[in-house]
Interface confidence: medium
């Protein structure tokens, strides 16, 4: 999983609260875009694990052909396996597909290390386990991969749910959700609750066992609790959000709250960690460090290098602290925090020793590209991608691995001024991160 | 499951030469040691030798140093016991034992050989 | 190479009697000393690692101590199933190094 940092593209937090709470404006939840309550037929429909991706069921083609694709937040092309690799158990055959068009382009996606390049067209496309829909999109056919699929993974492509501002070659290529919400009465949202399982799983349990929802067009209340806390989404290219304060057990980092985001935060399920910018990486360990004390673990545990273990149940979660993400929300000087605990940020490993060690590698990394909120912390909560609203929701996770003492948390309205300074504005040129 | 399967064993005259297989499943054979523990009829234990296939790192015991090579294929994740030069008192049960390496840090303190194979019998005899 | 001298090199008792049994390394491997069991015709199996940690699985009548040069295997209340052959091990430095074995008998 490139060292279980970008699953599969990228290789791999001013304001201060004042404690002084504000009245919630109504207790109702805002009226949303998507219809609510109950996606029966969506809830479980992912499956996968935080080091090797989530991934639903797709069919392409006339006779539809099954495959798996990776739910990746952080990019926005369709690309499907279209030829053999050693990785894949099976690929879209385009010959085989009555409705398939050639749009006659080709498409070249390099990232630091590796890279993938295809044949654009488009088909039908649907989701069994998704809304009762056939869409057509565009299409990338892999026909050749380097370091792109995951041994042992179980998809065969990747789904780019962010903006057509990044999509490749270029933003004239429309994006699969962009195609699903203009071809049908799909509401322009959609919701994601990835499970972590908190404890290494097999193939066989990944492929038995359940990783997550993703409902199409809303949100489903039974995968969370409590509210949902709302921030907005800064720019439509990745699902940029601005953090603005940074807590590790409640102490704040204290950092210029630019550095949080420079050069820029992003929501992104395809990767794995908690991607964090240089100086804040540095400051971020050395709190957690000082929080952990009471054992000691080597510079490799905290560069991800180096798995640390305890033998089986006995993981002193108690010494390690909480990390809290103060948000911009939605209502001028407010925002809301929230919480993970060391049971998403320290990932169990499946690959290890013995089954009689539980082993954990420590998943919050260094980012030269910004704050990447992947799998780690999207494991927390539920989290609402209301594009028709230009904003990102949060609220626990009905799914979220905790104890008995403690528990990851969406809380606020916190007062929080001059919010707007936190974010950074990017010098414009032809940049993507797409190669970091 | 973690196992650990040797493989190889046999008869051999002296002088001659045997190439011993481990193959291991259930484990992250590229971050562990593979060790050769051998055992001669009614006596005890003797390491071999290691090596720990994500660094190519070996150790041998003097004893065989410079007849025995071990090595490792971590695209089969199989550890190999190349012995030549073979001698009578190299007969005994050879087996083969995992260590997590440093890449597994343990809090308190570093594990020992913690899986072992069943064993493979190497008689060296006229 | 460092000697794993252990002792006695062999014992008699009863079930539910404490047995000690003692190896001394040759210079200070600090902790890094296992011990192990064998049963005729079967392979080691770890017992304690780092000189007095438990391995998962084992009994708790199992406990292991000592630091530098001396360290000690005791079973509190011996079994049935633990009549066996014991050894040291000294993981601390290349080459590792077993002791001689502790056969433990029935009286």
């Known amino acids: 999983t490139q060292h279980g940092i970008r699953l599969p593209l990228r290789s791999g937090l001013g304001g201060a609260p004042l404690g002084l709470r504000l009245p919630r404006e109504t207790d109702e939840e805002p009226e949303e875009p998507g219809r609510r309550g109950s996606f029966v037929e969506m809830v479980d429909n992912l499956r996968g694990k935080s080091g090797q991706g989530y991934y639903v069921e797709m069919t392409v083609g006339s006779p539809p052909q099954t495959l798996n694709i990776l739910v990746d937040t952080g990019s926005s092309n369709f690309a499907v396996g279209a030829a053999p690799h050693p990785f894949l158990h099976r690929y879209y055959q385009r010959q085989l597909s009555s409705t398939y068009r050639d749009l006659r382009k080709g498409v070249y996606v390099p990232y630091t290390q590796g890279k993938w390049e295809g044949e654009l067209g488009t088909d039908l496309v649907s989701i069994p386990h998704g809304p009762n829909v056939t869409v057509r999109a565009n299409i990338a056919a892999i026909t050749e991969s380097d370091k792109f699929f995951i041994n042992g993974s179980n998809w065969e492509g990747i789904l780019g749910l962010a903006y057509a501002e990044i999509a490749r070659p270029d933003d004239s290529l429309e994006p699969f959700f962009d195609s699903l919400v203009k071809q049908t009465h799909v509401p322009n949202l959609f919701s994601l609750q990835l499970c972590g399982a908190g404890f290494p799983l097999n193939q066989s349990e990944v492929l038995a066992s359940v990783g997550g929802s993703m409902i199409i067009g809303g949100i489903d209340h039974s995968l969370y609790t409590g509210s949902l806390w709302y921030t907005p989404i800064r720019r439509e290219w990745y699902y940029e959000v601005i953090i603005v304060r940074v807590e590790i057990n409640g102490q704040d980092l204290k950092m210029d709250c630019k550095e949080y985001n420079y050069d820029k935060s992003i929501v992104d399920s395809g990767t794995t960690n908690l991607r964090l910018p240089k100086k804040v990486f540095e400051a971020a360990v050395k709190s957690i460090k000082a929080a952990s004390s009471t054992e000691k673990f080597p510079d490799g545990f905290w560069l991800g290098e180096q798995l640390v273990c305890w033998q089986a149940g006995t993981t002193p979660w108690n010494i390690f602290p909480v990390i809290s993400l103060y948000l911009m929300g939605e209502v001028t000087n407010q925002s809301f925090r929230i919480t993970i605990l060391p049971q998403q940020y320290l990932r169990p490993v499946e690959d290890v020793a013995t089954s009689q060690d539980d082993c954990y590698k420590f998943a919050i990394s260094q980012s030269s590209t910004g704050t990447v909120m992947g799998a780690v912390i999207m494991e927390g909560f539920y989290v609402v991608f209301d594009r028709a609203r230009k904003r990102i929701g949060f609220a626990v996770s009905a799914c979220h691995v905790h104890d008995e003492f403690r528990t990851a948390a969406v809380e606020g309205p916190f007062v929080t001024l001059d919010m707007e300074d936190c974010g950074y504005n990017i010098p414009q040129t032809d940049e993507s991160t797409l190669m970091t | 499951e973690v196992q650990l399967v040797e493989s190889g064993g046999g008869l051999v005259q002296p002088g001659g030469s045997l190439r011993l297989s481990c193959a291991a499943s259930g484990f992250n054979f590229y971050y562990s040691s593979i060790h050769w523990v051998r055992q001669a009829p009614g006596k005890g234990l003797e390491w071999v030798a290691s090596i720990s296939p994500y660094s190519g790192y070996t150790s041998y015991a003097d004893s065989v140093k410079g007849r025995f090579t071990i090595s490792a294929d971590t695209s089969k994740n199989t550890a190999y016991l190349q012995m030549n030069s073979l001698r009578a008192e190299d007969t005994a049960v050879y087996y083969c034992?995992?260590?997590?390496?440093?890449?597994?840090?343990?809090?308190?303190?570093?594990?020992?050989?913690?899986?072992w194979g069943q064993g493979t019998l190497v008689t060296v005899s006229s | 190479d460092i000697q794993m001298t252990q002792s006695p090199s062999s014992l008699s008792a009863s079930v539910g009697d404490r047995v000690t049994i003692t190896c001394r390394a040759s210079q200070s491997v600090s902790s890094a000393v296992a011990w192990y069991q064998q049963k005729p015709g079967k392979a080691p199996k770890l017992l304690i690692s780092w000189a007095s940690w438990l391995y998962s699985g084992v009994p708790s009548r199992f406990s292991g101590s000592g630091s530098g040069t001396d360290f000690t295997l005791t079973i509190s209340s011996l079994q049935p199933e633990d009549f066996a052959t014991y050894y040291c091990?000294?993981?601390?430095?290349?080459?590792?190094?077993f002791g001689q074995g502790t056969k433990v008998e029935i009286k």
């Open positions: 091990q000294q993981y601390s430095y290349s080459p590792f190094t």
């Open positions: 034992a995992r260590q997590p390496t440093h890449y597994y840090y343990y809090a308190k303190g570093y594990k020992a050989m913690d899986y």
